[in-house]
Protein backbone atom coordinates (compact mmCIF):
# COMPACT_ATOMS: atom_id res chain seq x y z
CA UNK A 1 0.00 0.00 0.00
CA UNK A 2 1.09 3.53 -0.78
CA UNK A 3 1.00 5.91 2.16
CA UNK A 4 -1.04 9.06 1.58
CA UNK A 5 -0.15 12.17 3.55
CA UNK A 6 -2.92 14.41 4.92
CA UNK A 7 -1.87 17.77 6.30
CA UNK A 8 -3.93 19.74 8.78
CA UNK A 9 -3.45 22.88 10.80
CA UNK A 10 -3.17 22.66 14.58
CA UNK A 11 -6.44 23.55 16.26
CA UNK A 12 -8.50 22.99 13.13
CA UNK A 13 -10.31 19.94 11.76
CA UNK A 14 -8.75 17.51 9.31
CA UNK A 15 -10.83 15.26 7.11
CA UNK A 16 -9.27 12.02 5.85
CA UNK A 17 -10.94 10.09 3.04
CA UNK A 18 -10.35 6.45 2.17
CA UNK A 19 -11.91 5.22 -1.10
CA UNK A 20 -12.66 1.52 -1.57
CA UNK A 21 -14.51 -0.95 -3.81
CA UNK A 22 -18.04 -0.84 -2.39
CA UNK A 23 -18.93 -4.32 -3.66
CA UNK A 24 -15.72 -5.99 -2.49
CA UNK A 25 -16.25 -4.65 1.01
CA UNK A 26 -20.05 -4.94 1.05
CA UNK A 27 -21.43 -5.73 4.49
CA UNK A 28 -18.13 -5.03 6.23
CA UNK A 29 -17.74 -2.55 9.03
CA UNK A 30 -14.78 -0.18 8.85
CA UNK A 31 -12.25 1.14 11.35
CA UNK A 32 -9.56 3.78 11.82
CA UNK A 33 -6.47 2.71 13.73
CA UNK A 34 -3.15 4.20 14.73
CA UNK A 35 0.07 2.41 13.89
CA UNK A 36 2.22 1.90 16.98
CA UNK A 37 5.78 1.91 15.72
CA UNK A 38 7.02 0.85 12.31
CA UNK A 39 6.28 -2.83 12.83
CA UNK A 40 3.89 -2.57 15.75
CA UNK A 41 0.17 -3.29 15.89
CA UNK A 42 -2.50 -0.90 14.67
CA UNK A 43 -4.48 0.28 17.68
CA UNK A 44 -8.19 0.83 16.99
CA UNK A 45 -9.25 4.45 17.45
CA UNK A 46 -12.83 4.30 16.22
CA UNK A 47 -15.04 1.99 14.15
CA UNK A 48 -18.28 2.41 12.25
CA UNK A 49 -21.67 1.54 13.67
CA UNK A 50 -22.12 -2.03 14.92
CA UNK A 51 -24.93 -2.42 12.39
CA UNK A 52 -23.45 -2.08 8.92
CA UNK A 53 -26.71 -0.67 7.57
CA UNK A 54 -26.22 2.29 9.92
CA UNK A 55 -22.60 2.92 8.90
CA UNK A 56 -23.58 6.35 7.54
CA UNK A 57 -24.16 7.52 11.12
CA UNK A 58 -21.17 9.40 12.47
CA UNK A 59 -19.48 7.77 15.45
CA UNK A 60 -17.11 9.62 17.73
CA UNK A 61 -14.30 8.55 20.00
CA UNK A 62 -12.98 11.67 21.69
CA UNK A 63 -12.07 14.12 18.94
CA UNK A 64 -12.11 11.52 16.13
CA UNK A 65 -15.22 10.74 14.08
CA UNK A 66 -15.88 8.11 11.42
CA UNK A 67 -18.63 7.74 8.83
CA UNK A 68 -18.99 5.38 5.87
CA UNK A 69 -20.65 5.97 2.52
CA UNK A 70 -21.18 2.28 1.77
CA UNK A 71 -22.77 2.89 -1.64
CA UNK A 72 -20.19 5.35 -2.89
CA UNK A 73 -17.31 3.47 -1.29
CA UNK A 74 -15.74 6.24 0.76
CA UNK A 75 -14.78 6.06 4.42
CA UNK A 76 -14.35 9.49 6.02
CA UNK A 77 -12.51 10.22 9.25
CA UNK A 78 -12.61 13.63 10.90
CA UNK A 79 -9.93 14.66 13.40
CA UNK A 80 -11.35 17.65 15.31
CA UNK A 81 -9.15 20.23 17.04
CA UNK A 82 -5.98 18.72 15.55
CA UNK A 83 -3.04 18.58 17.96
CA UNK A 84 0.68 17.88 17.47
CA UNK A 85 0.31 14.49 19.17
CA UNK A 86 -2.20 13.47 16.48
CA UNK A 87 0.61 13.33 13.92
CA UNK A 88 1.63 9.84 12.86
CA UNK A 89 0.76 6.83 10.76
CA UNK A 90 -2.80 5.49 10.61
CA UNK A 91 -4.81 2.96 8.64
CA UNK A 92 -8.32 2.81 7.26
CA UNK A 93 -9.49 -0.77 7.65
CA UNK A 94 -12.26 -3.06 6.42
CA UNK A 95 -13.31 -5.59 9.04
CA UNK A 96 -14.33 -9.19 8.47
CA UNK A 97 -14.51 -11.53 11.39
CA UNK A 98 -11.69 -10.56 13.73
CA UNK A 99 -9.46 -9.65 10.80
CA UNK A 100 -8.92 -6.37 9.01
CA UNK A 101 -7.92 -5.48 5.46
CA UNK A 102 -6.02 -2.25 4.97
CA UNK A 103 -7.90 0.15 2.69
CA UNK A 104 -5.35 2.96 2.91
CA UNK A 105 -2.28 3.88 4.92
CA UNK A 106 -2.39 7.49 6.04
CA UNK A 107 0.31 9.76 7.41
CA UNK A 108 -1.15 12.70 9.35
CA UNK A 109 1.02 15.82 9.49
CA UNK A 110 0.17 18.68 11.81
CA UNK A 111 1.15 22.13 10.61
CA UNK A 112 1.57 25.15 12.86
CA UNK A 113 -1.35 27.54 13.02
CA UNK A 114 -0.02 30.65 11.24
CA UNK A 115 -2.03 32.81 13.64
CA UNK A 116 -0.50 31.09 16.68
CA UNK A 117 2.87 32.68 17.59
CA UNK A 118 3.83 30.03 20.13
CA UNK A 119 6.97 27.95 19.50
CA UNK A 120 6.24 25.34 16.84
CA UNK A 121 9.21 23.22 17.89
CA UNK A 122 7.00 20.48 19.25
CA UNK A 123 5.20 19.97 15.93
CA UNK A 124 6.19 16.66 14.36
CA UNK A 125 7.12 15.97 10.76
CA UNK A 126 8.51 12.78 9.27
CA UNK A 127 12.29 12.66 9.29
CA UNK A 128 14.59 12.10 6.34
CA UNK A 129 15.91 8.57 5.88
CA UNK A 130 15.99 5.74 3.38
CA UNK A 131 13.50 5.67 0.54
CA UNK A 132 9.89 4.74 1.20
CA UNK A 133 8.58 2.07 -1.16
CA UNK A 134 5.83 2.73 -3.71
CA UNK A 135 5.80 6.48 -3.13
CA UNK A 136 3.99 8.86 -5.43
CA UNK A 137 2.89 12.47 -5.16
CA UNK A 138 -0.78 13.41 -4.89
CA UNK A 139 -1.37 17.10 -4.30
CA UNK A 140 -4.25 18.73 -2.40
CA UNK A 141 -4.68 18.49 1.33
CA UNK A 142 -3.16 15.07 0.93
CA UNK A 143 -0.19 13.57 -0.86
CA UNK A 144 1.71 10.32 -0.90
CA UNK A 145 5.04 10.10 0.85
CA UNK A 146 7.89 11.52 -1.14
CA UNK A 147 10.90 9.34 -1.78
CA UNK A 148 13.24 9.63 1.15
CA UNK A 149 10.51 10.18 3.70
CA UNK A 150 9.63 7.66 6.36
CA UNK A 151 6.46 7.53 8.43
CA UNK A 152 8.26 7.40 11.77
CA UNK A 153 10.99 9.70 13.11
CA UNK A 154 14.47 8.19 13.48
CA UNK A 155 15.07 6.49 16.82
CA UNK A 156 18.52 8.17 17.07
Amino acid sequence: HNTTVFQGVAGQSLQVSCPYDSMKHWGRRKAWCRQLGEKGPCQRVVSTHNLWLLSFLRRWNGSTAITDDTLGGTLTITLRNLQPHDAGLYQCQSLHGSEADTLRKVLVEVLADPLDHRDAGDLWFPGESESFEDAHVEHSISRSLLEGEIPFPPTS
Epitope: M23, K24, W26, G27, W52, L95, H96, G97, S98, E99
Partner: antibody
Framework: EVQLVQSGAEVKKPGESLKISCKGS????????IAWVRQMPGKGLEWMGI????????RYSPDFQGQVTISADKSISTAYLQWSSLKASDTAMYFC????????????????WGQGTLVTVSS | DIQMTQSPSSVSASVGDRVTITCRAS??????LAWYQQKPGKAPKLLIY???SLQWGVPSRFSGSGSGTDFTLTISSLQPEDFATYFC?????????FGQGTKLEIK
Protein backbone atom coordinates in the same frame (compact mmCIF):
# COMPACT_ATOMS: atom_id res chain seq x y z
CA GLU B 1 -31.08 -18.72 -9.89
CA VAL B 2 -27.56 -18.64 -8.46
CA GLN B 3 -25.45 -21.50 -9.77
CA LEU B 4 -21.82 -22.58 -9.64
CA VAL B 5 -21.02 -25.21 -12.24
CA GLN B 6 -17.68 -26.99 -12.03
CA SER B 7 -15.70 -28.78 -14.71
CA GLY B 8 -15.82 -32.57 -14.96
CA ALA B 9 -13.85 -35.29 -13.19
CA GLU B 10 -10.18 -35.65 -14.02
CA VAL B 11 -7.80 -38.62 -13.95
CA LYS B 12 -4.14 -37.64 -14.02
CA LYS B 13 -0.68 -39.04 -13.46
CA PRO B 14 1.74 -37.73 -10.83
CA GLY B 15 3.76 -34.79 -12.15
CA GLU B 16 1.13 -33.67 -14.62
CA SER B 17 -0.51 -30.24 -14.54
CA LEU B 18 -4.20 -29.54 -14.18
CA LYS B 19 -6.61 -26.59 -14.17
CA ILE B 20 -10.20 -27.04 -13.02
CA SER B 21 -12.93 -24.42 -13.32
CA CYS B 22 -16.00 -23.04 -11.60
CA LYS B 23 -18.46 -20.96 -13.63
CA GLY B 24 -20.93 -18.71 -11.84
CA SER B 25 -24.30 -17.58 -13.12
CA UNK B 26 -27.45 -15.90 -11.84
CA UNK B 27 -25.58 -13.19 -9.92
CA UNK B 28 -22.84 -10.57 -10.31
CA UNK B 29 -19.85 -12.91 -10.38
CA UNK B 30 -17.25 -10.14 -10.05
CA UNK B 31 -18.79 -8.90 -6.80
CA UNK B 32 -18.56 -12.00 -4.60
CA UNK B 33 -15.53 -13.82 -3.26
CA ILE B 34 -15.10 -17.43 -4.43
CA ALA B 35 -13.45 -20.02 -2.20
CA TRP B 36 -11.98 -23.43 -3.01
CA VAL B 37 -12.47 -26.28 -0.55
CA ARG B 38 -10.85 -29.74 -0.63
CA GLN B 39 -12.43 -32.94 0.62
CA MET B 40 -10.19 -35.98 0.60
CA PRO B 41 -11.92 -39.39 0.34
CA GLY B 42 -13.96 -40.04 3.50
CA LYS B 43 -12.56 -36.95 5.19
CA GLY B 44 -13.60 -33.47 6.24
CA LEU B 45 -13.53 -30.08 4.52
CA GLU B 46 -10.34 -28.03 4.09
CA TRP B 47 -10.38 -24.37 3.04
CA MET B 48 -7.70 -23.82 0.39
CA GLY B 49 -8.07 -20.15 -0.43
CA ILE B 50 -10.33 -17.44 -1.75
CA UNK B 51 -10.38 -14.94 -4.62
CA UNK B 52 -12.26 -11.74 -5.38
CA UNK B 53 -12.90 -11.87 -9.15
CA UNK B 54 -13.36 -8.10 -9.35
CA UNK B 55 -9.65 -7.46 -8.87
CA UNK B 56 -8.20 -10.99 -8.48
CA UNK B 57 -7.23 -10.39 -4.84
CA UNK B 58 -6.29 -13.86 -3.52
CA ARG B 59 -5.76 -15.27 -0.02
CA TYR B 60 -4.32 -18.76 0.48
CA SER B 61 -4.35 -21.13 3.40
CA PRO B 62 -0.74 -21.63 4.54
CA ASP B 63 -1.24 -25.36 3.93
CA PHE B 64 -1.90 -24.74 0.23
CA GLN B 65 0.28 -21.69 -0.47
CA GLY B 66 2.74 -22.59 -3.22
CA GLN B 67 0.96 -25.88 -3.91
CA VAL B 68 -1.90 -24.50 -6.00
CA THR B 69 -2.80 -21.32 -7.87
CA ILE B 70 -6.21 -19.70 -7.65
CA SER B 71 -7.26 -17.32 -10.41
CA ALA B 72 -10.38 -15.88 -12.01
CA ASP B 73 -11.57 -14.39 -15.29
CA LYS B 74 -14.43 -12.04 -14.49
CA SER B 75 -15.22 -11.54 -18.19
CA ILE B 76 -16.44 -15.14 -18.40
CA SER B 77 -17.55 -15.45 -14.75
CA THR B 78 -15.11 -18.28 -14.06
CA ALA B 79 -12.73 -19.11 -11.23
CA TYR B 80 -9.89 -21.59 -11.53
CA LEU B 81 -7.81 -23.88 -9.36
CA GLN B 82 -4.59 -25.19 -10.85
CA TRP B 83 -1.64 -27.43 -10.12
CA SER B 84 1.69 -27.40 -11.96
CA SER B 85 2.76 -30.84 -10.72
CA LEU B 86 0.18 -33.18 -9.23
CA LYS B 87 0.86 -35.67 -6.46
CA ALA B 88 -1.07 -38.79 -5.48
CA SER B 89 -2.04 -36.98 -2.27
CA ASP B 90 -3.95 -34.41 -4.35
CA THR B 91 -6.61 -37.05 -5.01
CA ALA B 92 -9.79 -35.49 -3.65
CA MET B 93 -13.09 -33.80 -4.41
CA TYR B 94 -12.69 -30.06 -4.94
CA PHE B 95 -15.56 -27.65 -4.36
CA CYS B 96 -15.88 -24.00 -5.22
CA UNK B 97 -18.19 -21.93 -3.06
CA UNK B 98 -19.53 -18.38 -3.15
CA UNK B 99 -18.62 -16.40 -0.07
CA UNK B 100 -21.30 -13.97 1.02
CA UNK B 101 -20.83 -11.28 3.63
CA UNK B 102 -23.81 -11.03 5.95
CA UNK B 103 -24.13 -7.46 7.18
CA UNK B 104 -25.48 -8.66 10.53
CA UNK B 105 -21.99 -9.57 11.68
CA UNK B 106 -19.58 -8.39 8.95
CA UNK B 107 -18.20 -11.83 8.25
CA UNK B 108 -18.61 -14.17 5.31
CA UNK B 109 -20.10 -17.62 4.85
CA UNK B 110 -20.42 -20.03 1.93
CA UNK B 111 -23.99 -19.79 0.73
CA UNK B 112 -23.76 -21.49 -2.69
CA TRP B 113 -21.54 -24.40 -3.69
CA GLY B 114 -20.52 -26.03 -6.94
CA GLN B 115 -21.25 -29.72 -7.43
CA GLY B 116 -17.59 -30.64 -6.98
CA THR B 117 -14.82 -31.86 -9.27
CA LEU B 118 -13.28 -35.24 -8.48
CA VAL B 119 -9.54 -35.28 -9.17
CA THR B 120 -7.81 -38.66 -9.17
CA VAL B 121 -4.03 -38.79 -9.35
CA SER B 122 -2.60 -42.24 -9.91
CA SER B 123 0.29 -43.79 -11.78
CA ASP C 1 -4.89 -21.63 12.84
CA ILE C 2 -8.07 -22.00 14.85
CA GLN C 3 -8.93 -25.64 15.52
CA MET C 4 -12.59 -26.65 15.45
CA THR C 5 -13.58 -29.79 17.36
CA GLN C 6 -16.99 -31.39 16.96
CA SER C 7 -18.66 -33.91 19.20
CA PRO C 8 -19.83 -36.52 18.91
CA SER C 9 -18.14 -37.76 15.73
CA SER C 10 -21.24 -39.85 15.04
CA VAL C 11 -24.69 -40.16 16.55
CA SER C 12 -27.55 -42.58 16.00
CA ALA C 13 -31.10 -41.29 16.36
CA SER C 14 -34.64 -41.94 15.22
CA VAL C 15 -37.14 -39.85 13.28
CA GLY C 16 -38.78 -37.39 15.69
CA ASP C 17 -35.80 -37.28 18.07
CA ARG C 18 -34.16 -34.08 19.26
CA VAL C 19 -30.44 -34.06 18.43
CA THR C 20 -27.70 -31.70 19.57
CA ILE C 21 -24.23 -31.45 18.03
CA THR C 22 -21.52 -29.37 19.65
CA CYS C 23 -18.55 -27.51 18.22
CA ARG C 24 -15.67 -26.05 20.20
CA ALA C 25 -13.16 -23.51 18.90
CA SER C 26 -9.55 -23.49 20.14
CA UNK C 27 -9.90 -19.74 20.78
CA UNK C 28 -12.74 -17.25 20.99
CA UNK C 29 -14.45 -16.58 17.68
CA UNK C 30 -17.30 -14.34 18.90
CA UNK C 31 -20.36 -15.47 16.91
CA UNK C 32 -18.52 -16.00 13.63
CA LEU C 33 -19.60 -19.59 13.09
CA ALA C 34 -21.54 -21.50 10.43
CA TRP C 35 -23.10 -24.95 10.25
CA TYR C 36 -23.32 -26.98 7.03
CA GLN C 37 -25.10 -30.18 6.10
CA GLN C 38 -23.55 -32.59 3.61
CA LYS C 39 -25.11 -35.68 2.07
CA PRO C 40 -23.03 -38.40 0.34
CA GLY C 41 -21.82 -37.34 -3.11
CA LYS C 42 -23.22 -33.83 -2.69
CA ALA C 43 -21.87 -30.40 -1.88
CA PRO C 44 -22.30 -28.95 1.61
CA LYS C 45 -25.34 -26.77 2.26
CA LEU C 46 -25.35 -23.71 4.54
CA LEU C 47 -27.83 -24.11 7.41
CA ILE C 48 -26.83 -21.54 10.04
CA TYR C 49 -24.56 -18.49 9.89
CA UNK C 50 -23.47 -16.01 12.56
CA UNK C 51 -23.92 -18.85 15.09
CA UNK C 52 -27.70 -18.57 15.27
CA SER C 53 -29.10 -17.05 12.05
CA LEU C 54 -31.10 -19.47 9.94
CA GLN C 55 -30.22 -19.43 6.25
CA TRP C 56 -33.12 -18.66 3.94
CA GLY C 57 -35.06 -21.81 2.99
CA VAL C 58 -33.74 -23.95 5.85
CA PRO C 59 -36.48 -25.57 8.00
CA SER C 60 -37.06 -23.98 11.41
CA ARG C 61 -36.38 -27.28 13.19
CA PHE C 62 -32.68 -26.37 12.78
CA SER C 63 -31.31 -23.88 15.28
CA GLY C 64 -27.89 -22.73 16.41
CA SER C 65 -26.59 -21.13 19.57
CA GLY C 66 -23.42 -20.20 21.37
CA SER C 67 -20.64 -17.63 21.25
CA GLY C 68 -16.97 -17.43 22.12
CA THR C 69 -15.69 -21.00 22.00
CA ASP C 70 -18.74 -23.23 22.49
CA PHE C 71 -21.51 -23.70 19.95
CA THR C 72 -24.42 -26.07 19.37
CA LEU C 73 -26.56 -27.14 16.44
CA THR C 74 -29.95 -28.51 17.45
CA ILE C 75 -32.45 -30.39 15.30
CA SER C 76 -35.70 -30.28 17.25
CA SER C 77 -37.50 -33.16 15.55
CA LEU C 78 -35.48 -35.30 13.16
CA GLN C 79 -36.88 -35.90 9.69
CA PRO C 80 -35.75 -38.68 7.32
CA GLU C 81 -33.95 -36.16 5.09
CA ASP C 82 -31.83 -34.89 8.01
CA PHE C 83 -29.61 -37.98 8.14
CA ALA C 84 -26.32 -36.60 6.85
CA THR C 85 -22.96 -35.28 8.03
CA TYR C 86 -22.80 -31.87 9.73
CA PHE C 87 -19.80 -29.55 9.80
CA CYS C 88 -19.12 -26.37 11.76
CA UNK C 89 -16.84 -23.68 10.32
CA UNK C 90 -15.28 -20.60 11.87
CA UNK C 91 -15.48 -17.31 9.98
CA UNK C 92 -13.34 -15.41 12.48
CA UNK C 93 -9.98 -15.49 10.72
CA UNK C 94 -7.97 -16.88 7.83
CA UNK C 95 -7.50 -19.67 7.12
CA UNK C 96 -11.13 -20.63 7.54
CA UNK C 97 -11.31 -23.98 9.31
CA PHE C 98 -13.96 -26.67 9.64
CA GLY C 99 -14.77 -29.19 12.31
CA GLN C 100 -14.09 -32.83 11.46
CA GLY C 101 -17.79 -33.54 10.98
CA THR C 102 -20.58 -35.34 12.85
CA LYS C 103 -22.32 -38.18 11.05
CA LEU C 104 -25.99 -38.46 11.93
CA GLU C 105 -27.21 -42.02 11.32
CA ILE C 106 -30.56 -43.78 11.59
CA LYS C 107 -30.89 -45.85 14.75
Amino acid sequence: EVQLVQSGAEVKKPGESLKISCKGSGYSFRSYWIAWVRQMPGKGLEWMGIIYPGDSDVRYSPDFQGQVTISADKSISTAYLQWSSLKASDTAMYFCARSRTFYYDSSDYFDYWGQGTLVTVSS
Amino acid sequence: DIQMTQSPSSVSASVGDRVTITCRASQGISSWLAWYQQKPGKAPKLLIYAASSLQWGVPSRFSGSGSGTDFTLTISSLQPEDFATYFCQQADSFPRTFGQGTKLEIK
